[in-house]
Interface confidence: medium
């Protein structure tokens, strides 16, 4: 999916109003210095792109996140503000079939959202030059 | 209180128009997103669209893609469908519903209803 | 597109357990809601986000999901729950109900 077409600002706010939280609720406990940032992006398209693929796809070791409210809200937000996202998800779902595994917060769902944390960051910050 | 009045039903040929409007009232309108359910006669619930917040996206259900037109009024407190090429099927008792309040409720369902109002395609 | 498949009634005595199932792929993965549809009636959200109930509504009404199917429970069921229920999920954006089902209270 393309994200060049979003209302960012609309992202941005809701960023700002509630994911932001959500991402800090999951992360209660962990210290911040604990993981480094290994995924990046350059530019807004690019950020939602990136952050889109941490939240909805499996990984080994953290089968899914989907259901977290960090990324229902995260879904609604781009399902809201990003023209034909839907349709492109609901192709995506179907060609996926992906199983949820037994809600379990490991280290490595812990690390990725820590990695999320990094992206929406930089979503917020995009005339920063890149480091 | 909390009320939805939908208005606009009756009786059309096929392959006409009809505008739905469903009037809100007792609270802020222009901060949740709205749906159109409909019910044919004897049948089950059908989704027919949903709008969110000004300048949003708008999404439909396959039967009525590309025919049925959602919009709303924040100014009027109203929300409207409008329905050209109506077919037999589009028979069906026609409602409004609340959705969500900001995205943390998105996948809540909706928590408030219409009485509906009744669309006949017959000719 | 996505389908939501319940069964087409269910009858229970009074005072027993309803169970209404909602079957669909991948189910667990969705928050479902339920809703109450008494004749001539309009529906009536009962639980929301797969177990949780809207103020207003009994105790008695309860859902979980997981795997590909939801449930709907009514413990201590009464005759005024006799109605038709529909679960409901998103597909990403778009909205789907299952084909609901008739509650029939012995």
């Known amino acids: 999916y393309d994200f060049t077409n979003c209302d960012f600002e609309k992202i941005k706010a809701a960023y700002l109003s509630t994911i932001s939280k959500d991402l800090i609720t999951y992360m209660s406990g962990t210290k911040s210095t604990e993981f480094n940032n290994t995924v990046s992006c350059s530019n807004r398209p690019h950020c939602l792109t990136e952050i889109q693929s941490l939240t909805f796809n499996p990984t080994a070791g953290c089968a899914s996140l989907a259901k977290e409210m960090f990324a229902m809200k995260t879904k609604a937000a781009l399902a809201i503000w990003c023209p034909g996202y839907s349709e492109t998800q609901i192709n995506a779902t179907q060609a996926m079939k992906k199983r949820r595994k037994r809600k379990v917060t490991t280290n490595k769902c812990l690390e990725q959202v820590s990695q999320l944390q990094g992206l929406w960051r930089r979503f917020n910050r995009p005339l920063l030059k890149q480091q | 209180q909390v009320q939805l009045v939908e208005s606009g039903g009756g009786v059309v040929q096929p392959g006409r128009s009809l505008r739905l409007s469903c009037a809100a009232s007792?609270?802020?309108?222009?901060?949740?997103?709205m749906h159109w359910v409909r019910q044919a006669p004897g049948k089950g619930l059908e989704w027919v669209a949903v709008?969110?917040?000004?300048?949003?996206?708008?999404y439909y259900g396959d039967s009525v893609k590309g025919r049925f037109t959602i919009s709303r009024d924040n100014s009027k407190n109203t929300l409207y469908l409008q329905m050209n090429s109506l077919r037999g099927e589009d028979t069906a008792v026609y409602y409004c519903a609340r959705g969500a309040h900001d995205y943390g409720d998105f996948y809540y369902g909706m928590d408030v209803w219409g009485q509906g109002t009744t669309v006949t395609v017959s000719s | 597109s996505y389908e939501l498949t319940q069964p087409a009634s269910v009858s229970v005595s009074p005072g027993q357990i309803a169970s209404i199932t909602c079957s669909g792929d991948?189910?667990?993965?969705?928050?479902i809601c339920w809703y109450q549809q008494k004749p001539g009636q309009s529906p009536v959200r009962v639980i929301y986000q797969d177990n949780k109930r809207p103020s207003g509504i009994p105790e008695r009404f309860s859902g979980s999901n997981s795997g590909n199917t939801a449930t709907l429970t009514i413990s201590g069921t009464q005759a005024m729950d006799e109605a038709d229920y529909y679960c409901q999920a998103w597909d990403s954006s778009t909205v789907v109900f299952g084909g609901g089902t008739k509650l029939t209270v012995l």
């Open positions: 991948n189910l667990g993965d969705k928050y």
């Open positions: 007792g609270f802020t309108f222009s901060s949740y997103g």
């Open positions: 709008k969110w917040y000004e300048g949003s996206n708008k």
